[in-house]
Interface confidence: medium
Protein backbone atom coordinates (compact mmCIF):
# COMPACT_ATOMS: atom_id res chain seq x y z
CA UNK A 1 0.00 0.00 0.00
CA UNK A 2 1.48 3.34 -1.10
CA UNK A 3 2.11 5.78 1.74
CA UNK A 4 -0.08 8.86 1.74
CA UNK A 5 1.75 12.03 0.73
CA UNK A 6 0.66 15.58 1.56
CA UNK A 7 2.27 17.80 -1.03
CA UNK A 8 2.83 21.52 -0.55
CA UNK A 9 4.77 22.38 -3.71
CA UNK A 10 5.86 25.91 -2.76
CA UNK A 11 8.38 26.37 0.04
CA UNK A 12 7.53 30.05 0.21
CA UNK A 13 5.01 32.58 -1.08
CA UNK A 14 5.31 36.36 -0.88
CA UNK A 15 2.33 38.72 -1.19
CA UNK A 16 1.67 42.41 -0.65
CA UNK A 17 -0.43 43.46 2.33
CA UNK A 18 -4.07 43.69 1.30
CA UNK A 19 -3.74 41.10 -1.46
CA UNK A 20 -4.78 37.44 -1.47
CA UNK A 21 -2.42 34.50 -0.98
CA UNK A 22 -2.92 31.07 -2.51
CA UNK A 23 -1.43 28.15 -0.56
CA UNK A 24 -1.33 24.95 -2.56
CA UNK A 25 -1.81 21.47 -1.18
CA UNK A 26 -2.63 18.14 -2.79
CA UNK A 27 -2.82 14.62 -1.40
CA UNK A 28 -1.61 11.51 -3.21
CA UNK A 29 -4.48 9.28 -2.14
CA UNK A 30 -8.13 9.43 -1.11
CA UNK A 31 -7.42 6.76 1.51
CA UNK A 32 -7.73 6.81 4.45
CA UNK A 33 -10.94 8.81 4.68
CA UNK A 34 -10.67 11.95 6.76
CA UNK A 35 -10.49 15.73 6.65
CA UNK A 36 -7.74 18.17 5.75
CA UNK A 37 -7.07 21.11 8.04
CA UNK A 38 -4.76 24.06 7.57
CA UNK A 39 -2.66 25.50 10.38
CA UNK A 40 -0.26 28.38 10.76
CA UNK A 41 2.78 27.26 12.70
CA UNK A 42 3.60 23.86 14.16
CA UNK A 43 3.37 22.26 17.59
CA UNK A 44 0.93 23.14 20.36
CA UNK A 45 0.92 26.85 19.53
CA UNK A 46 -0.30 26.39 15.98
CA UNK A 47 -3.30 28.38 14.77
CA UNK A 48 -6.23 26.69 13.05
CA UNK A 49 -6.68 28.49 9.74
CA UNK A 50 -9.21 26.35 7.92
CA UNK A 51 -11.33 23.36 8.75
CA UNK A 52 -13.93 22.42 6.19
CA UNK A 53 -15.84 20.31 8.69
CA UNK A 54 -16.83 23.01 11.18
CA UNK A 55 -16.31 26.63 12.00
CA UNK A 56 -16.53 29.86 10.07
CA UNK A 57 -13.38 30.99 8.29
CA UNK A 58 -14.43 34.15 6.49
CA UNK A 59 -11.10 35.07 4.90
CA UNK A 60 -10.34 31.59 3.63
CA UNK A 61 -11.83 29.87 0.61
CA UNK A 62 -11.05 26.49 -0.91
CA UNK A 63 -9.58 26.79 -4.41
CA UNK A 64 -11.28 23.56 -5.52
CA UNK A 65 -14.63 22.26 -4.35
CA UNK A 66 -13.60 20.14 -1.34
CA UNK A 67 -16.98 18.38 -1.27
CA UNK A 68 -16.53 17.07 -4.81
CA UNK A 69 -16.09 13.34 -5.09
CA UNK A 70 -12.45 12.24 -5.56
CA UNK A 71 -11.14 15.75 -4.85
CA UNK A 72 -7.44 15.64 -4.00
CA UNK A 73 -6.74 19.38 -4.14
CA UNK A 74 -7.00 21.13 -0.78
CA UNK A 75 -5.40 24.43 -1.74
CA UNK A 76 -6.76 27.55 -0.04
CA UNK A 77 -6.89 31.27 -0.74
CA UNK A 78 -6.56 33.76 2.12
CA UNK A 79 -7.89 37.23 1.37
CA UNK A 80 -6.90 40.66 2.65
CA UNK A 81 -3.49 39.62 3.97
CA UNK A 82 -1.94 41.59 6.85
CA UNK A 83 1.55 41.47 8.41
CA UNK A 84 0.13 39.37 11.26
CA UNK A 85 -0.61 36.60 8.72
CA UNK A 86 3.08 36.00 8.06
CA UNK A 87 4.30 32.56 9.05
CA UNK A 88 4.56 28.96 7.89
CA UNK A 89 1.32 27.25 6.87
CA UNK A 90 0.81 23.51 7.06
CA UNK A 91 -1.73 21.36 5.26
CA UNK A 92 -2.53 18.43 7.57
CA UNK A 93 -4.38 15.21 6.80
CA UNK A 94 -6.48 13.56 9.52
CA UNK A 95 -8.02 10.09 9.72
CA UNK A 96 -11.75 10.20 10.39
CA UNK A 97 -12.62 9.19 13.93
CA UNK A 98 -13.88 10.41 17.28
CA UNK A 99 -11.79 12.47 17.55
CA UNK A 100 -10.05 12.66 14.18
CA UNK A 101 -6.42 11.51 14.32
CA UNK A 102 -3.60 13.52 12.72
CA UNK A 103 -1.89 11.40 10.07
CA UNK A 104 0.47 13.49 8.02
CA UNK A 105 1.51 17.08 7.51
CA UNK A 106 2.81 18.79 4.42
CA UNK A 107 6.29 20.30 4.53
CA UNK A 108 4.87 23.78 5.01
CA UNK A 109 4.71 26.97 2.95
CA UNK A 110 6.21 30.13 4.38
CA UNK A 111 4.08 33.20 3.75
CA UNK A 112 5.87 36.52 3.82
CA UNK A 113 4.01 39.82 3.62
CA UNK A 114 5.41 42.82 1.78
CA UNK A 115 4.37 46.39 2.48
CA UNK A 116 1.77 47.51 -0.05
CA UNK A 117 3.35 49.87 -2.59
CA UNK A 118 2.05 53.39 -2.04
Amino acid sequence: EEELQVIQPEKSVSVAAGDSATLNCTVSSLIPVGPIQWFRGAGPGRELIYNLKEGHFPRVTAVSDPTKRNNMDFSIRISNITPADAGTYYCVKFRKGSPDVELKSGAGTELSVRAKPS
Epitope: A17, G43, P44, L48, F57, N80, T82, A84, K116
Partner: antibody, heavy 119, light 108 residues
Framework: DVQLVESGGGVVRPGESLRLSCAAS????????MNWVRQAPGEGLEWVSR????????DYAESVKGRFTISRDNSENTLYLQMNSLRAEDTAVYYC????????????WGLGALVTVSS | ETVLTQSPATLSVSPGERATLSCRAS??????LAWHQQKPGQAPRLLIY???NRATGIPDRFSGSGSGTDFTLTISSLQTEDSAVYYC??????????FGGGTKVEIK
Protein backbone atom coordinates in the same frame (compact mmCIF):
# COMPACT_ATOMS: atom_id res chain seq x y z
CA ASP B 1 -27.12 32.57 19.16
CA VAL B 2 -23.59 33.13 20.43
CA GLN B 3 -23.46 33.47 24.21
CA LEU B 4 -20.47 34.19 26.46
CA VAL B 5 -21.09 34.18 30.21
CA GLU B 6 -18.31 35.10 32.64
CA SER B 7 -18.20 34.01 36.27
CA GLY B 8 -15.76 33.95 39.18
CA GLY B 9 -15.41 37.66 39.84
CA GLY B 10 -15.30 39.04 43.36
CA VAL B 11 -13.40 41.03 45.95
CA VAL B 12 -9.85 39.98 46.87
CA ARG B 13 -6.90 41.49 48.72
CA PRO B 14 -3.68 42.52 46.97
CA GLY B 15 -1.44 39.51 46.37
CA GLU B 16 -4.32 37.05 46.30
CA SER B 17 -5.58 34.95 43.36
CA LEU B 18 -8.81 34.54 41.46
CA ARG B 19 -9.92 32.43 38.52
CA LEU B 20 -12.43 33.69 35.98
CA SER B 21 -14.43 31.39 33.73
CA CYS B 22 -16.28 32.09 30.51
CA ALA B 23 -18.89 29.57 29.35
CA ALA B 24 -19.39 29.69 25.58
CA SER B 25 -22.30 28.43 23.51
CA UNK B 26 -23.87 28.90 20.09
CA UNK B 27 -20.71 28.41 18.01
CA UNK B 28 -17.91 25.91 17.35
CA UNK B 29 -15.81 26.95 20.36
CA UNK B 30 -12.79 24.81 19.46
CA UNK B 31 -12.37 26.56 16.09
CA UNK B 32 -11.84 30.08 17.44
CA UNK B 33 -9.23 32.06 19.28
CA MET B 34 -10.58 33.71 22.46
CA ASN B 35 -9.55 36.79 24.40
CA TRP B 36 -9.89 38.53 27.74
CA VAL B 37 -10.35 42.31 27.71
CA ARG B 38 -10.71 44.44 30.83
CA GLN B 39 -12.12 47.84 31.69
CA ALA B 40 -11.11 49.68 34.85
CA PRO B 41 -13.83 51.84 36.43
CA GLY B 42 -14.46 54.87 34.25
CA GLU B 43 -11.70 53.89 31.82
CA GLY B 44 -11.42 52.49 28.32
CA LEU B 45 -10.90 48.94 27.03
CA GLU B 46 -7.58 47.16 27.60
CA TRP B 47 -6.74 43.85 25.92
CA VAL B 48 -5.39 41.37 28.48
CA SER B 49 -4.75 38.01 26.84
CA ARG B 50 -5.44 35.75 23.86
CA UNK B 51 -5.44 31.98 23.40
CA UNK B 52 -5.50 30.21 20.07
CA UNK B 53 -8.16 27.70 19.05
CA UNK B 54 -6.25 24.61 20.18
CA UNK B 55 -5.11 26.15 23.45
CA UNK B 56 -1.37 25.83 22.87
CA UNK B 57 -0.64 29.40 21.85
CA UNK B 58 -1.05 32.33 24.24
CA ASP B 59 -0.29 36.06 24.27
CA TYR B 60 -0.42 38.54 27.15
CA ALA B 61 -0.37 42.28 27.72
CA GLU B 62 2.86 43.41 29.38
CA SER B 63 0.89 44.59 32.41
CA VAL B 64 -0.20 41.03 33.32
CA LYS B 65 2.63 38.89 31.91
CA GLY B 66 3.92 36.41 34.48
CA ARG B 67 0.90 36.89 36.76
CA PHE B 68 -2.08 35.87 34.62
CA THR B 69 -2.58 32.60 32.75
CA ILE B 70 -5.18 32.05 30.04
CA SER B 71 -6.40 28.54 29.27
CA ARG B 72 -9.35 26.76 27.72
CA ASP B 73 -11.18 23.44 27.86
CA ASN B 74 -12.56 22.74 24.40
CA SER B 75 -14.46 19.70 25.62
CA GLU B 76 -16.36 21.91 28.08
CA ASN B 77 -16.56 25.03 25.85
CA THR B 78 -14.99 27.09 28.62
CA LEU B 79 -12.33 29.80 28.71
CA TYR B 80 -10.37 30.59 31.88
CA LEU B 81 -8.20 33.36 33.27
CA GLN B 82 -6.11 32.51 36.31
CA MET B 83 -5.07 35.74 38.02
CA ASN B 84 -2.28 35.57 40.60
CA SER B 85 -0.48 38.27 42.61
CA LEU B 86 -3.38 40.63 42.07
CA ARG B 87 -2.82 44.36 42.40
CA ALA B 88 -5.16 47.29 43.01
CA GLU B 89 -4.68 48.34 39.37
CA ASP B 90 -6.16 45.00 38.22
CA THR B 91 -9.56 46.17 39.49
CA ALA B 92 -11.81 46.08 36.45
CA VAL B 93 -14.67 44.41 34.67
CA TYR B 94 -13.22 41.49 32.73
CA TYR B 95 -14.87 40.54 29.45
CA CYS B 96 -14.29 37.41 27.42
CA UNK B 97 -14.43 38.05 23.68
CA UNK B 98 -14.62 35.73 20.72
CA UNK B 99 -12.32 36.40 17.80
CA UNK B 100 -13.83 36.48 14.32
CA UNK B 101 -10.98 34.48 12.82
CA UNK B 102 -7.41 33.69 13.84
CA UNK B 103 -6.30 37.22 12.98
CA UNK B 104 -9.24 39.46 13.53
CA UNK B 105 -11.51 41.66 15.53
CA UNK B 106 -13.73 40.65 18.45
CA UNK B 107 -17.20 39.89 17.16
CA UNK B 108 -18.94 38.80 20.38
CA TRP B 109 -18.44 39.90 23.97
CA GLY B 110 -19.57 38.49 27.29
CA LEU B 111 -21.42 40.55 29.88
CA GLY B 112 -18.35 40.85 32.08
CA ALA B 113 -17.22 39.88 35.58
CA LEU B 114 -16.20 42.49 38.12
CA VAL B 115 -12.89 41.93 39.92
CA THR B 116 -12.12 44.26 42.84
CA VAL B 117 -8.67 44.21 44.44
CA SER B 118 -8.70 46.13 47.68
CA SER B 119 -7.12 45.93 51.11
CA GLU C 1 3.19 49.46 18.75
CA THR C 2 0.28 51.06 16.96
CA VAL C 3 -1.46 53.81 18.92
CA LEU C 4 -5.08 54.71 18.11
CA THR C 5 -6.22 58.24 18.88
CA GLN C 6 -9.94 58.99 18.92
CA SER C 7 -11.47 62.43 18.65
CA PRO C 8 -13.34 64.20 19.96
CA ALA C 9 -13.37 62.78 23.49
CA THR C 10 -17.01 63.84 23.84
CA LEU C 11 -19.56 64.69 21.17
CA SER C 12 -22.95 66.28 21.89
CA VAL C 13 -25.44 65.88 19.06
CA SER C 14 -29.16 66.56 18.77
CA PRO C 15 -31.49 63.69 17.81
CA GLY C 16 -31.77 63.36 14.04
CA GLU C 17 -28.44 65.07 13.42
CA ARG C 18 -25.25 63.50 12.05
CA ALA C 19 -22.45 62.39 14.37
CA THR C 20 -18.92 62.01 13.00
CA LEU C 21 -16.28 60.20 15.08
CA SER C 22 -12.61 59.98 14.16
CA CYS C 23 -9.95 57.33 14.82
CA ARG C 24 -6.35 57.94 13.78
CA ALA C 25 -3.64 55.25 13.82
CA SER C 26 0.04 56.05 14.41
CA UNK C 27 0.94 53.79 11.46
CA UNK C 28 -1.02 52.15 8.68
CA UNK C 29 -3.47 49.46 9.71
CA UNK C 30 -4.75 48.90 6.17
CA UNK C 31 -8.49 48.28 6.45
CA UNK C 32 -8.11 46.28 9.67
CA LEU C 33 -10.12 48.51 11.94
CA ALA C 34 -13.30 47.76 13.89
CA TRP C 35 -15.70 49.98 15.82
CA HIS C 36 -17.43 48.85 19.02
CA GLN C 37 -20.30 50.51 20.85
CA GLN C 38 -20.62 50.38 24.64
CA LYS C 39 -23.76 51.66 26.29
CA PRO C 40 -23.68 52.55 30.01
CA GLY C 41 -23.50 49.45 32.19
CA GLN C 42 -23.36 47.11 29.18
CA ALA C 43 -20.73 45.04 27.38
CA PRO C 44 -19.24 46.33 24.14
CA ARG C 45 -20.95 45.38 20.87
CA LEU C 46 -19.34 45.13 17.44
CA LEU C 47 -20.65 47.73 14.98
CA ILE C 48 -18.22 47.87 12.05
CA TYR C 49 -15.35 45.65 10.91
CA UNK C 50 -12.74 45.90 8.15
CA UNK C 51 -13.30 49.68 8.32
CA UNK C 52 -16.54 49.70 6.32
CA ASN C 53 -18.56 46.51 6.91
CA ARG C 54 -21.57 46.62 9.22
CA ALA C 55 -21.85 43.73 11.66
CA THR C 56 -24.96 41.57 11.70
CA GLY C 57 -28.05 43.40 12.96
CA ILE C 58 -26.48 46.87 12.98
CA PRO C 59 -28.79 49.60 11.62
CA ASP C 60 -27.74 51.23 8.37
CA ARG C 61 -27.50 54.66 10.00
CA PHE C 62 -24.06 53.47 11.18
CA SER C 63 -21.34 53.56 8.54
CA GLY C 64 -17.56 53.36 8.55
CA SER C 65 -15.02 54.79 6.15
CA GLY C 66 -11.28 55.24 5.78
CA SER C 67 -8.14 53.16 5.33
CA GLY C 68 -4.49 53.38 6.23
CA THR C 69 -4.32 55.72 9.21
CA ASP C 70 -7.54 57.78 9.17
CA PHE C 71 -10.95 56.31 9.89
CA THR C 72 -14.42 57.68 10.50
CA LEU C 73 -17.56 56.30 12.09
CA THR C 74 -20.68 58.18 10.99
CA ILE C 75 -24.11 57.97 12.59
CA SER C 76 -26.27 59.56 9.91
CA SER C 77 -29.32 60.38 12.03
CA LEU C 78 -28.67 60.09 15.73
CA GLN C 79 -31.26 58.27 17.85
CA THR C 80 -31.53 58.57 21.63
CA GLU C 81 -30.48 54.91 21.97
CA ASP C 82 -27.14 55.72 20.29
CA SER C 83 -25.92 57.45 23.46
CA ALA C 84 -22.79 55.40 24.22
CA VAL C 85 -19.00 55.29 24.14
CA TYR C 86 -17.54 54.22 20.81
CA TYR C 87 -14.15 52.49 20.59
CA CYS C 88 -12.01 51.71 17.56
CA UNK C 89 -9.84 48.57 17.53
CA UNK C 90 -6.99 47.70 15.17
CA UNK C 91 -6.03 44.14 14.26
CA UNK C 92 -3.39 44.69 11.60
CA UNK C 93 -0.45 44.31 13.98
CA UNK C 94 -0.75 42.15 17.10
CA UNK C 95 -0.12 41.29 19.85
CA UNK C 96 -1.11 43.46 21.55
CA UNK C 97 -4.56 44.28 20.27
CA UNK C 98 -5.12 47.99 20.67
CA PHE C 99 -8.23 50.06 21.30
CA GLY C 100 -8.63 53.80 20.99
CA GLY C 101 -9.44 55.83 24.09
CA GLY C 102 -13.11 56.12 23.11
CA THR C 103 -15.52 58.86 22.08
CA LYS C 104 -18.54 59.51 24.28
CA VAL C 105 -21.63 60.45 22.28
CA GLU C 106 -24.20 62.42 24.25
CA ILE C 107 -27.67 63.46 23.22
CA LYS C 108 -28.21 67.22 23.31
Amino acid sequence: DVQLVESGGGVVRPGESLRLSCAASGFSFSSYAMNWVRQAPGEGLEWVSRINSGGGGTDYAESVKGRFTISRDNSENTLYLQMNSLRAEDTAVYYCAKQYDWNGFFDYWGLGALVTVSS
Amino acid sequence: ETVLTQSPATLSVSPGERATLSCRASQTVGSKLAWHQQKPGQAPRLLIYDATNRATGIPDRFSGSGSGTDFTLTISSLQTEDSAVYYCQQYYYWPPYRFGGGTKVEIK
